[in-house]
Amino acid sequence: EEELQVIQPDKSVLVAAGETATLRCTATSLIPVGPIQWFRGAGPGRELIYNQKEGHFPRVTTVSDLTKRNNMDFSIRIGNITPADAGTYYCVKFRKGSPDDVEFKSGAGTELSVRAKPSAPVVSGPAARATPQHTVSFTCESHGFSPRDITLKWFKNGNELSDFQTNVDPVGESVSYSIHSTAKVVLTREDVHSQVICEVAHVTLQGDPLRGTANLSETIRVPPTLEVTQQPVRAENQVNVTCQVRKFYPQRLQLTWLENGNVSRTETASTVTENKDGTYNWMSWLLVNVSAHRDDVKLTCQVEHDGQPAVSKSHDLKVSAHPKEQGSNTAAENTGSNERNIY
């Protein structure tokens, strides 16, 4: 009779998280008599997974009936596998002894690798808004996947981005891994409707990658452009001056009219019109009573957009010594405007 061999035919098995792992082990002989034990790892720190003789192992079931007299199959199934179960499992035959059984022979081991899906990627943008032509950073994170190999791509409106850095942690062996990527995106005035997408591909996803998105509407600030114009005279001694506030985003905007540097009226943008690109337009007007002024009037439209420093545009209104000629003396003069564009 040849000496007993412990055969673990599968050197390495790959199981998806949540599934059941089958670890095969057979002996080539019934002699010597003694139980089988399964361990994860080798050496003194090894972890007992199953003991044929005693103990309670709720996640482990045997493939065959170990109580049968001539049984030589000691394969086990481990249910509800998680990444923490990864490792090398050894089937070890013990010889009956007194008082304790003695380790007789071990199988070559079966390495259990666990496939775990990455979590849905979470994309986060900068804490503060930025204006067009500025570069902003977006981060993408996904966790809990195994094995370590993973592919991450960035897109802006379907176009793949190339300026990004990605790290997979930890660097060494681990039960599961995390990925962190930072992409740089240059904002343009047309980006209110734009999206940044982080796409993660992993062997567990069977060709159907996970995506996380961020809307640039939460990141971008498009400063308004201002235009002050004087409208035709509405009444003999009244002039209508309008301030066109164009192409701004977000909507939060406060406008102040100044007459010769004194606050005349303050209002908040309410009934705005939306442009195709997602930016807004708004118009405010001021009715100036010319007869109340002896000298020329400097009218200033001052706009505070989204908590930023005010921008303004001024208009000089000529007050004639002869009110009846007012209609012919309405030429406006724009002075020192301070304007910026943001999308």
Epitope: I7, P9, K11, V13, T26, S64, N71, M72, D73, A108
Partner: antibody, heavy 119, light 112 residues
Framework: QVQLQQPRAELVKPGASVMLSCKAS????????IHWVRQGPGQGLEWIGL????????DCSETFKNKATLTVDTSSSTAYMQLSSLASEDSAVYYC????????????WGQGTLVTVSA | DVVMTQTPLTLSVTIGQPASISCKSS???????????LNWLLQRPGQSPKRLIY???KLDSGVPDRFTGSGSGTDFTLKISRVEAEDLGVYYC?????????FGGGTKLEIK
């Protein structure tokens, strides 16, 4: 010495089933895993599955899970593979092979059975 | 499953000349015990496969020493120092590290 005997050929009609046999001798049949391998005409080798004669513990590759059923008869030291719902693309040579201890795997092969599926 | 890729598909060699077959695996075949479970098989025309080499480089008994196996990780090579007429057939690499076992597509050795 270790021997695995297989019938030379089987002719089967489409849609039918066939039971292929692999009779082992020269070793303790119940001690070692038996594997089944397929080779299509002019093709390479493809692993089908394995069975342990002592327990009937079996597993098949995903490709053959609904096609092949592995069984053993320890009294005659014979392993069987039933192939069901046969189609012309199942025409191939089917081999049995024995696993041994430690590194002694795919050493011992049967001669193979040529299965021809034809009306 | 681990994919085994063999090159070339066909090898035409003059008797007495050397031959070399490459086998690449899609994953490392190195197992945790430090061993690499890669075999080379030869299937002569009309016969069942026969194992020539196991554990990358160990020759089975009765296999002539003109056969040598080498490699590690994912890249493996079978070399025949001087091809003889009895060497013709199809050579397969097969891995036993990962479940399920997978074979290379085969390399047909022809005699010129």
């Amino acid at each position: 010495q270790v021997q695995l005997q297989q019938p030379r050929a089987e002719l089967v009609k489409p849609g039918a089933s066939v039971m292929l046999s692999c009779k082992a001798s020269g070793y303790t049949f119940s001690s070692y895993w038996i594997h089944w391998v397929r080779q299509g005409p002019g093709q390479g080798l493809e692993w089908i599955g394995l069975i342990h004669p002592n327990s009937g513990n079996t597993d098949c590759s995903e490709t053959f899970k609904n096609k092949a059923t592995l069984t053993v008869d320890t009294s005659s030291s014979t392993a069987y593979m039933q192939l069901s719902s046969l189609a012309s693309e199942d025409s191939a040579v089917y081999y049995c092979a024995r696993d041994g201890a430690s590194y002694d795997w795919f050493v011992h092969w049967g001669q193979g059975t040529l299965v021809t599926v034809s009306a | 499953d681990v994919v085994m890729t063999q090159t070339p598909l066909t090898l035409s060699v003059t008797i007495g000349q050397p031959a070399s077959i490459s086998c690449k695996s899609s994953q490392s075949l190195l197992y945790t015990n430090g061993k690499t479970y890669l075999n080379w098989l030869l299937q002569r025309p009309g016969q069942s496969p026969k194992r020539l080499i196991y554990l990358v480089s160990k020759l089975d008994s009765g296999v002539p020493d003109r056969f040598t196996g080498s490699g590690s990780g994912t890249d493996f090579t079978l070399k025949i120092s001087r091809v003889e007429a009895e060497d013709l057939g199809v050579y397969y690499c097969v891995q036993g590290t990962h479940f399920p076992r997978t074979f290379g597509g085969g390399t047909k050795l022809e005699i010129k």
